[in-house]
């Protein structure tokens, strides 16, 4: 059963990056408002974003409680404003979202190269360990804290003077690579979760090149 004068939400979509998770839907409301409910498969339906005219709801606080759970959301439509009222007690119209498992599906945010340091013919490249909104013991966890060894980084590097790229991989946040003495190199990294079937890779980080401020060089 539904309430008169309302349109059910549609195109319910999860938008999630590094566990920052927002449910989006359509349409823009006319004489109606929305309330979102979220649940785990075995849990209770918890109301969020009460009676909103927005078409998105930030559900980060809920999903970070257990990122390995599978969540389902639903969006209720209620008539609002100066509309004809029936006094109906029936359950309002609602639409279910697709299921969403944050650990398996959140997009990996674009990584950042924190620093690189050259020591002779070796370069140590460090990837910034981005903070997430996942908490443990009142402390925000980093991406590495959450994913552990499931998360790897791929480093792409090349001589500034050529286009031939080399790659390296690490399951930490550091690379140690061999370079030719006297050559400047450029670097880009990508976060990867090889075990995933969807959203396996992040976009590439901004390119950083030797001879710019990020690096430190020591000839030994």
């Amino acid at each position: 059963s539904g309430t008169t004068n309302t349109v059910a939400a549609y195109n319910l979509t999860w938008k999630s990056t590094n566990f920052k998770t927002i449910l989006e839907w359509e349409p823009k409301p006319v004489n109606q408002v929305y309330t979102v409910q979220i649940s785990t498969k075995s849990g209770d339906w918890k109301s969020k974003c009460f009676y909103t005219t927005d078409t998105e709801c930030d559900l980060t606080d809920e999903i970070v409680k257990d990122v390995k759970q599978t969540y389902l959301a639903r969006v209720f439509s209620y008539p609002a404003g100066n509309v004809e009222s029936t006094g109906s007690a029936g359950e309002p119209l609602y639409e279910n979202s697709p299921e969403f498992t944050p650990y398996l599906e959140t997009n990996l945010g674009q990584p950042t190269i924190q620093s690189f340091e050259q020591v002779g013919t070796k370069v140590n490249v460090t990837v910034e360990d981005e903070r997430t909104l996942v908490r443990r013991n009142n402390t925000f966890l980093s991406l590495r804290d959450v994913f552990g060894k499931d998360l790897i980084y791929t480093l792409y590097y090349w001589k500034s003077s050529s286009s031939g790229k080399k790659t390296a991989k690490t399951n930490t946040n550091e690379f140690l690579i061999d370079v030719d003495k006297g050559e400047n190199y450029c670097f880009s990294v990508q976060a990867v979760i090889p075990s995933r079937t969807v959203n396996r890779k992040s976009t590439d980080s901004p390119v950083e090149c030797m001879g710019q401020e990020k690096g430190e060089f020591r000839e030994i």
């Epitope: 918890k46 009676y51 609002a80 009222s85 359950e91």
Partner: antibody, heavy 118, light 106 residues
Framework: QVQLVQSGAEVKRPGSSVKVSCKAS????????MYWVRQAPGQGLEWIGQ????????NYNENFQGRVTITADKSTSTAYMELSSLRSEDTAVYYC???????????WGQGTLVTVSS | EIVLTQSPALLSLSPGERATLSCSAS?????MYWYQQKPGQAPRLLIQ???NLASGVPARFSGRGSGTDFTLTISSLEPEDFAVYYC?????????FGGGTKVEIK
């Protein structure tokens, strides 16, 4: 049907604490937000705070922050509102109220009169 | 916080008459709720989301308004309608209630 039954009237001394209970029946207790609202004699209504029994998530009115604690016991389907450092201005009827379709204060308990007097 | 001002504070009318109660918000709100309270009883929800009748509420009650100005209308007062009426908003935290309008028998 939804029923919210509150504990009986209380008389308290200034500086002491009071804990009011609200026993719910007729629905799945853990699935709905529970709110607390008070009404001083001859006055309007004031929201105190709320709890989601499913996970214990709670929020409070800043005016009561530090003095109020709202809890829920899923095993007995009972919500509690504890107010400390009582003063005479806290004399009021305290209501528990539950969300419904289209409104957060849809179902109300019968109220508990708390009198703070020396 | 949003302050809701109800007017008049007291409305003296006879059964069968039309009652119009006003609620003015200190800032624009999305929608308004209305409650009825009788002596010794808890408030009872009448209108939600500005104009929707709550379950079991007679059709003689209606709500309208937008922005800062909202009204509750009782088209023809019945003896059981004499009570105190409160408006309430939750567009902004904390939720707030108006001071009430008492509708008494003239």
């Amino acid at each position: 049907q939804v029923q919210l039954v509150q504990s009986g009237a209380e008389v308290k001394r200034p500086g002491s604490s009071v804990k009011v209970s609200c026993k719910a029946s007729g629905y799945t207790f853990s699935s709905y937000w529970m709110y607390w609202v008070r009404q001083a004699p001859g006055q309007g209504l004031e929201w105190i705070g709320q709890i989601y029994p499913g996970d214990g998530d709670s929020n409070y009115n800043e005016n009561f922050q530090g003095r109020v604690t709202i809890t829920a016991d899923k095993s007995t389907s009972t919500a509690y509102m504890e107010l400390s450092s009582l003063r005479s201005e806290d004399t009021a009827v305290y209501y528990c109220t539950r969300e419904g379709y289209g409104n957060r204060f849809a179902y109300w308990g019968q109220g508990t009169l708390v009198t703070v007097s020396s | 916080e949003i302050v809701l001002t109800q007017s008049p504070a007291l409305l003296s009318l006879s059964p069968g008459e039309r009652a119009t109660l006003s609620c003015s918000a200190s800032s624009s709100v999305s929608y308004m709720y209305w409650y009825q309270q009788k002596p010794g009883q808890a408030p009872r929800l009448l209108i939600q989301l500005t104009s929707n009748l709550a379950s079991g509420v007679p059709a003689r009650f209606s709500g309208r308004g937008s922005g800062t100005d909202f009204t509750l209308t009782i088209s023809s007062l019945e003896p059981e309608d004499f009570a105190v009426y409160y408006c309430q908003q939750w567009s902004y935290n904390p939720p707030t209630f108006g001071g009430g309008t008492k509708v008494e028998i003239k």
